[in-house]
């Protein structure tokens, strides 16, 4: 017998949609092989209607799809706008139609329930609004108008023009009678509930001359949209609930095992701690639509999510909702990268950010997640070179190592730098990732002077001490600008007294500027790297002043000042309306930092460089 399994019988009604789930053993071969849905003909052949390779027959065009869920060993065939002609015998299967693994499914599409002649059908989602139109003749214009609900053989009054409202519809129904000449009255029902489903009767007047019109109200629960995202990646839920609730609090919640819905985030400031640092609720558009972005997806994020609107910021019956079923694929295309990076006060971190390698030309960004209200993520740096002012001299985004990874370096760390940061691009939004920076006890491994004042026209020598564990690493000096950090020639000067516990293996790499020019003013970084992978960095600011006395100026280790004043993120970064989907500048207005002049020329700047035999350790 075939190991493929599904529903043996599926029954539906005309106009409906069905979701047929077919299960298969999730072996590696099965997960990746072709999936199909075919119809058995009289000849015994099975004609493909839709397959996982993108084929859709003309009969199914625009109304069917097949989605594979390899993790669960499931594929789902969705078919919409069913007609009686769709009744028949089908197969869902793997491989080739004629000799694959398959399962027989019988689909029966029947006519909808018999409705009285002239019945108008209204199909509306739960929580939405319906307007029932009720025509009448001139002679019934002055008479009572009413709407009844048919329950079995009886009719229950719902609302009438004498101000009666059935308690079940209190505060969500109104009857509108137009001005003279218009022979139609309307009944508007807001915040539809599943219990509102049924047959209604409009009536104007009484006795044999009365006007009647039947209305069949079908209230539908939203079918969850299937969302399949990669582990460690990102998902965006777009929620459009309609203008009626544009000014009502919005929420995203997750259905739990008790079938209640736990708030994940809402516009009233509530947020589930499990999503700390990796969720944003993007500001609503004028039409009331909004979106929620969740990054750093975990297996436990799987489940059914609902977005909705209610003044309490949580799920309530009869308010509009949208639904998604989120699956998290463990066979992720998104590479593993550290979710926590640790650095010491005064030290640095180098964060590796993954991006879709097919989008090497995309713009890269790094932003700081802020949890206040709905969350926001002001951009700090981008690959085009814009850096927030308060990060000048201590933040850089590098395209290296490339091929799906870029690097962000942040130095001169303070405790205020602890927090969550997002890596993103203007391309594939599913590759947004989150990293947490933690500031731990310890000393920076690289030691540079705090403040340096150079004299115009003279020679400046800046030392950078590194411990023996970095001896096998490549050492470099670079001049920071808002477009990156331009590497300068540097010189390795051998043992140093800065690291007493590392005896003769301590090293010194120094930068020489000769002669000093006005253009040399600015931030310089000393750093270590292995190939295209960056390790620690240390920053020093060089100020340039007019010549006072003759002679060269050498900054010795003993004269190294304290680190430059810490630069704290300005809490007043202004927000702009988020366009997170089209534009990854998540709620940030970038302040352009003016380029700090020409890079120092290689002929004037030099650093002594010599190799060391000792193997270096990790830079983290």
């Amino acid at each position: 017998k075939s190991p493929v399994f599904g529903p043996q019988e599926v029954s539906s009604v005309e106009g409906n949609s069905v979701s047929i789930k077919c299960y298969y053993p999730p072996t590696s071969v099965n997960r990746h092989t072709r999936k199909y849905w075919c119809r058995k003909g009289a000849s015994g052949r099975c004609i493909t209607l839709v397959s996982s390779e993108g084929y859709v027959s003309s009969n199914y065009a625009g109304r069917a799809n097949l989605t594979n869920f390899p993790e669960n060993g499931t594929f789902v065939v969705n078919i919409a706008q069913l007609s009686r002609d769709d009744s028949g015998h089908y197969k869902c299967g793997l491989g080739i139609n004629s000799r694959g693994l398959s399962f027989d499914v019988s689909l029966e599409v029947s006519q909808g329930p018999e409705l009285p002649n002239g019945t108008e059908v209204y199909t509306v989602d739960v929580g939405r609004t319906v307007t029932i139109k009720c025509p009448f003749k001139t002679e019934n214009a002055p008479k009572t108008k009413a709407l009844y609900k048919k329950i079995g053989q009886t009719s229950v009054l719902v609302i009438d023009s004498r101000n009666y409202v059935n308690p079940n519809y209190k505060d969500r129904i109104r009857l509108r009678i137009p001005g003279t000449g218009q022979l139609i009255f309307t009944v508007v029902i807001d915040r539809l509930r599943l219990s509102d489903h049924g047959l209604y009767l409009c009536q104007a007047g009484d006795g044999s001359n009365r006007d009647e019109k039947n209305a069949d109200l079908q209230v539908l629960e939203p079918e969850p949209e299937l969302v399949y995202e990669d582990l460690r990646g990102s998902v965006t839920f777009h929620c459009a609930l309609g203008l009626e609730v544009a000014n009502v609090a919005k929420f995203l919640c997750r259905v739990n095992s008790r079938e209640t819905c736990d708030v994940v985030i809402n516009t009233l400031g509530k947020r589930d701690s499990a999503f700390e640092g990796r969720i944003l609720l993007n500001p609503q558009d004028k039409d009331g639509s909004f979106s929620v972005v969740i990054t750093g997806l975990r297996k436990e994020d799987e489940g059914r999510y609902l977005c909705g609107a209610h003044s309490d910021g949580q799920l309530q019956e009869g308010w509009p909702i949208q639904a998604w079923q989120l699956f998290v694929n463990e066979e992720s295309t998104i590479p593993r990268s550290p979710t926590v990076v640790k650095g010491v006060a005064g030290g640095s971190v180098a964060v590796l950010c993954p991006y879709n390698p097919k989008e090497s030309q995309s713009l890269k960004y790094w932003c700081l997640w802020e949890g206040a209200q709905n969350g926001r993520c002001p951009l700090l740096v981008e690959s085009q070179g814009l850096v927030q002012e308060q990060y000048e001299g201590r933040l850089s985004l590098l395209q290296e190592p490339g091929n799906g990874t870029f690097t962000v370096i942040l130095n001169q760390l303070t405790t205020q730098d602890a927090g969550f940061y997002w890596c993103l691009t203007n391309g594939d939004t599913r590759w947004r990732t989150t990293v947490e920076i933690k500031i731990i006890e310890g000393e920076p491994n690289l030691k540079v002077p705090g403040n340096v004042t150079a004299v115009l026209g003279e020679t400046l020598n800046i030392p950078c001490h590194f411990p023996c564990k970095f001896s096998s690493y490549e050492k470099y000096w670079c001049k920071w600008s808002n477009t990156g950090c331009q590497t300068l020639p540097s010189q390795d000067e051998g043992p140093s007294e800065a690291f007493v516990n590392c005896d003769e293996n301590s090293r010194l790499v120094s930068l020489t500027l000769n002669p000093v020019t006005r253009a040399d003013e600015g931030w310089y970084w000393c750093g270590v790297k292995q190939g295209h992978f960056y390790g620690e960095t240390a920053a020093v600011y060089v100020a340039v002043e007019e010549k006072k006395v003759a002679g060269s100026r050498y900054v010795s280790p003993a004269k190294a000042d304290a680190a430059p004043d810490e630069k704290v993120l300005d809490s007043g970064v202004r927000e702009i309306e988020n366009k997170a989907i089209q534009d990854p500048r998540l709620f940030a207005e970038e302040k352009v930092v003016a380029d700090t002049g020409d890079q120092a020329g290689g002929s004037r700047a030099s650093v002594d460089s010599s190799s060391s035999e000792e193997q270096g350790g990790s830079s983290k």
Epitope: F5, P7, Q8, E9, V10, S11, S12, V13, N16, S17, V18, S19, I20, K21, Y23, F69, N72, G73, T74, V76, L194, L220, E221, E223, P224, L226, V255, S257, E259, R304, A323, Q325, F327
Partner: nanobody, 129 residues
Framework: EVQLVESGGGLVQAGGSLRLSCAAS????????MGWFRQAPGKEREFVAA??????????YYAESVKGRFAISRDNAKTTAYLQMGSLNPEDTALYYC????????????????????WGQGTLVTVSS
């Protein structure tokens, strides 16, 4: 909280038939799934049949061993599921459990117990030869 109560079990001769009922109380499901599992002495619990409903659609699932002999259905009040069992044989002897859940949109194989949140106490079916 939802309670499930099975009934209709008993002793029947091989070739005979029985109709099991599973009544749910506590709430009505506008969409959901109700299934039947069975457990013979010394054996693992196994899937028998399930019925899933959502938005006017009904999906019926059967284990290979009962296809063509058993039929699952439910009443329109959405509170009771039935298992009509025919051509019974001694291998069908077991304790039959009813299981239910409100969320048919979980894409977990519903032959496994995992998708079902609510369970009944079971009703015994004995088929004598």
């Amino acid at each position: 909280e939802v309670q499930l109560v099975e009934s209709g079990g008993g002793l029947v001769q091989a070739g005979g038939s029985l109709r099991l009922s599973c009544a749910a109380s506590g709430r009505t499901f506008s969409s959901g799934i109700m299934g039947w599992f069975r457990q013979a002495p010394g054996k693992e619990r196994e899937f028998v049949a399930a019925i899933e409903w959502s938005g006017g659609n009904t999906y019926k699932y059967y284990a290979e061993s009962v296809k063509g002999r058993f039929a699952i259905s439910r009443d329109n009040a959405k509170t009771t599921a039935y298992l009509q069992m025919g051509s019974l044989n001694p291998e069908d002897t077991a304790l039959y459990y009813c299981a239910a859940d409100e969320s048919p949109s979980r894409y977990i194989d519903l032959r496994r117990p995992a998708p079902y949140h609510y369970w009944g106490q079971g009703t015994l079916v004995t088929v004598s030869s």
